[in-house]
Interface confidence: low
């Protein structure tokens, strides 16, 4: 399937609009600090070049790889060294090393200003004045802040973003129409970014085999009526799509994702009965819908797994003959029978099964050795079940904010070296598992909770990797992808930690807190809570609760005062003194 000109091939497959959008995303994800106008200029130059190649595939440079073309274009940026420092050294390398170099410099936490939402009228004016620029700016701002965002899915978000403005800027109450839609897109976008970041981490840190195992388990749960060979084909294709997107090959990724959606819809009879509605939608909606589709019903009367994977005398022969295929079948058969298990649990079970076969197939009596392998699964299944039960009970008792606070304290004591903003962000997200998953019936709780926690803990891992400060975090993040959550759960208070020096400035607040949104105010309080624990890691729950209650009362009192700033200054000193006394600082 070779093409004389790869850039012409992708331009024709994707169409000009998607081509330009994807090139913009790719460039913004690589050069995250470059101004919008510079990126637009680069994209226009690439697009004009692509058009010449469409007209004549034999034209000069049209035979070059996309990495070569895009890399050459990025390396024309004049301020590369001043803005990006050592990333400029990438430009001295040849492909494929140059692209690998760019990938390594992607920054999960770029030093960019927070996106402030303008007034609705201002946004609507900007949208009507130049719709194309307005939407490009959205792609640019999201892509540069989320350098691993799944590019074809970002096109879907942009389509919804456009639809929201098209509808709401004509509405009688623009704000009432638009703001909830923008909030929803923001929250869904953050979740989508985090989910994709885990896929890329899985591929980049643990390899294709780890990603394929994840995909076999997830697709087998989702499509339990599909044949193993069908699931295997989907896994192979899906792995290619995500490898491309995680590797910065966004045009190929979007093109292959469209092909995969087409294949799934053409073959839905042998895949799942739940795809009909998805397959009637336009391309971007269709792909999104397939990715989120509910699990199909399990086939009736599935035979016991034990016959093929334990009782059979040929287990070792089958395993030796094609290890990964045999383990893939085990994972497929187990996952399709267990939509109630998290993917990471299924992968732990498969790993246990693999380890047992490795040991037993070399033993004198293999069958005797592996006969009880399924008994080893019981504690692995019960551990997440019990953890979820306990935490959902705590969530129901405390509510989301206080549940987040409990997790903040728990995780700050486990890994106090981690930066306060990271601990706040991660613990807040961990705490959201309650409202997201605890409402579900038992059968849906574990896949919801544990797989969500995998996504959140990956955020901790990628943020920590940028500036490693804790050996414990490094250990949990790198040893095993599927055991990250149990590894963090098992961490106790870090007894080696030397408490942080007390700094009154950390606990000094001003009247500006009164004008913050409820969410921002919570973050301020939670930041203070983390700092308290870092100063006094042995503080009891009761002590911390008392200080936090005093703090909440102090904020409420001063925000009602006539002279707010004076109140914050005077009452703040008293609060700090009282807190120090209460905690014995």
């Amino acid at each position: 399937d070779a093409h004389k000109s790869e850039v012409a091939h992708r331009f024709k497959d994707l169409g000009e609009e998607n081509f330009k959008a994807l090139v913009l995303i790719a460039f913004a994800q690589y050069l995250q600090q470059c101004p919008f106008e510079d990126h637009v200029k680069l994209v226009n130059e690439v697009t004009e070049f692509a058009k010449t190649c469409v007209a004549d595939e034999s034209a000069e440079n049209c035979d070059k790889s996309l990495h070569t073309l895009f890399g050459d274009k990025l390396c024309t940026v004049a301020t590369l060294r001043e803005t990006y420092g050592e990333m400029a050294d990438c430009c001295a390398k040849q492909e494929p090393e140059r692209n690998e170099c760019f990938l390594q410099h992607k920054d999960d936490n770029p030093n960019l200003p927070r996106l402030v939402r303008p007034e609705v009228d201002v946004m609507c004016t900007a949208f009507h004045d130049n719709e194309e620029t307005f939407l490009k700016k959205y792609l640019y701002e999201i892509a540069r802040r989320h350098p691993y965002f799944y590019a074809p899915e970002l096109l879907f978000f942009a389509k919804r973003y456009k639809a929201a403005f098209t509808e709401c800027c004509q509405a009688a109450d623009k704000a009432a129409c638009l703001l909830p839609k923008l909030d929803e897109l923001r929250d869904e976008g953050k979740a989508s970014s985090a989910k994709q970041r885990l896929k890329c981490a899985s591929l980049q840190k643990f390899g294709e085999r780890a990603f394929k195992a994840w995909a076999v388990a997830r697709l087998s749960q989702r499509f339990p009526k599909a044949e193993f060979a069908e699931v295997s084909k989907l896994v192979t294709d899906l792995t290619k799509v995500h490898t491309e997107c995680c590797h910065g090959d966004l045009l190929e990724c979007a093109d292959d994702r469209a092909d995969l959606a087409k294949y799934i819809c053409e073959n839905q009879d042998s895949i799942s009965s739940k795809l009909k509605e998805c397959c009637e939608k336009p391309l971007l909606e269709k792909s999104h819908c397939i990715a989120e589709v509910e699990n199909d019903e399990m086939p009736a009367d599935l035979p016991s797994l034990a016959a093929d994977f334990v009782e059979s005398k040929d287990v070792c022969k089958n395993y030796a003959e094609a290890k990964d295929v045999f383990l893939g079948m085990f994972l497929y058969e187990y996952a399709r029978r267990h939509p109630d298990y998290s993917v990471v649990l299924l992968l732990r079970l498969a790993k246990t099964y693999e380890t047992t076969l490795e040991k037993c197939c070399a033993a004198a009596d293999p069958h005797e050795c592996y006969a009880k392998v399924f008994d080893e699964f019981k504690p692995l299944v019960e551990e997440p079940q019990n953890l979820i039960k306990q935490n959902c009970e705590l969530f129901e008792q405390l509510g989301e904010y206080k549940f987040q606070n409990a997790l903040l304290v728990r995780y700050t004591k486990k890994v106090p070296q981690v930066s306060t903003p990271t601990l706040v962000e991660v613990s807040r997200n961990l705490g959201k598992v309650g409202s997201k998953c605890c409402k579900h019936p038992e059968a849906k709780r574990m896949p919801c909770a544990e797989d969500y926690l995998s996504v959140v803990l990956n955020q901790l891992c990628v943020l920590h990797e940028k500036t490693p400060v804790s050996d414990r975090v490094t250990k949990c993040c790198t040893e095993s992808l599927v055991n990250r959550r149990p590894c963090f759960s098992a961490l106790e208070v870090d007894e080696t930690y030397v408490p942080k020096e007390f700094n009154a400035e950390t606990f000094t607040f001003h009247a500006d807190i009164c004008t913050l949104s409820e969410k921002e105010r919570q973050i301020k309080k939670q930041t203070a809570l983390v700092e308290l624990v870092k100063h006094k890691p042995k503080a009891t729950k009761e002590q911390l609760k008392a200080v936090m209650d005093d703090f909440a009362a102090f904020v409420e009192k001063c925000c009602k005062a006539d002279d707010k700033e004076t109140c914050f200054a005077e009452e703040g000193k008293k609060l700090v003194a009282a807190s120090q006394a209460a905690l014995g600082l």
Partner: nanobody
Framework: EVQLVESGGGLVQSGGSLRLSCAAS????????MSWVRQAPGKGPEWVSA????????RYAESVKGRFTISRDNAKKTLYLQMNSLKPEDTAVYYC????????GSQGTQVTVSS
């Protein structure tokens, strides 16, 4: 598209023979072990026989041992089941499946053995 199409079934007298074929397409046939499974009216699926990806290693259910022979031709992407000394209790829909699954992925071919 992954497809498995069985043929060769039919009506045969007790003690007679039939040769079933399964033509595979849409996946790397030579990389997978294959099985024959049958389902008698009103009963659950029963595993009959399996062959490894290369064709060297074969396995049979006790009920068919010595009478049935499984084989494959990877070049033709086809799986076979030679059935001799057929008995009325062999009457069922026979279908081929990938690996050791006893899940129907195809339509199957009807084998009826009359006494």
């Amino acid at each position: 598209e992954v497809q498995l199409v069985e043929s060769g079934g039919g009506l045969v007298q007790s003690g007679g023979s039939l040769r079933l074929s399964c033509a595979a397409s849409g996946f790397t046939f030579g990389s997978f072990g294959m099985s024959w499974v049958r389902q008698a009216p009103g009963k659950g699926p029963e595993w009959v026989s399996a062959v490894d990806s290369g064709g060297a290693d074969t396995r049979y259910a006790e009920s068919v041992k010595g009478r049935f022979t499984i084989s494959r031709d990877n070049a033709k992407k086809t799986l076979y089941l030679q059935m001799n000394s057929l008995k009325p209790e062999d009457t069922a829909v026979y279908y081929c499946t990938i690996g050791q699954s006893t899940t129907r992925g195809s339509q199957g071919t009807q084998v009826t053995v009359s006494s």
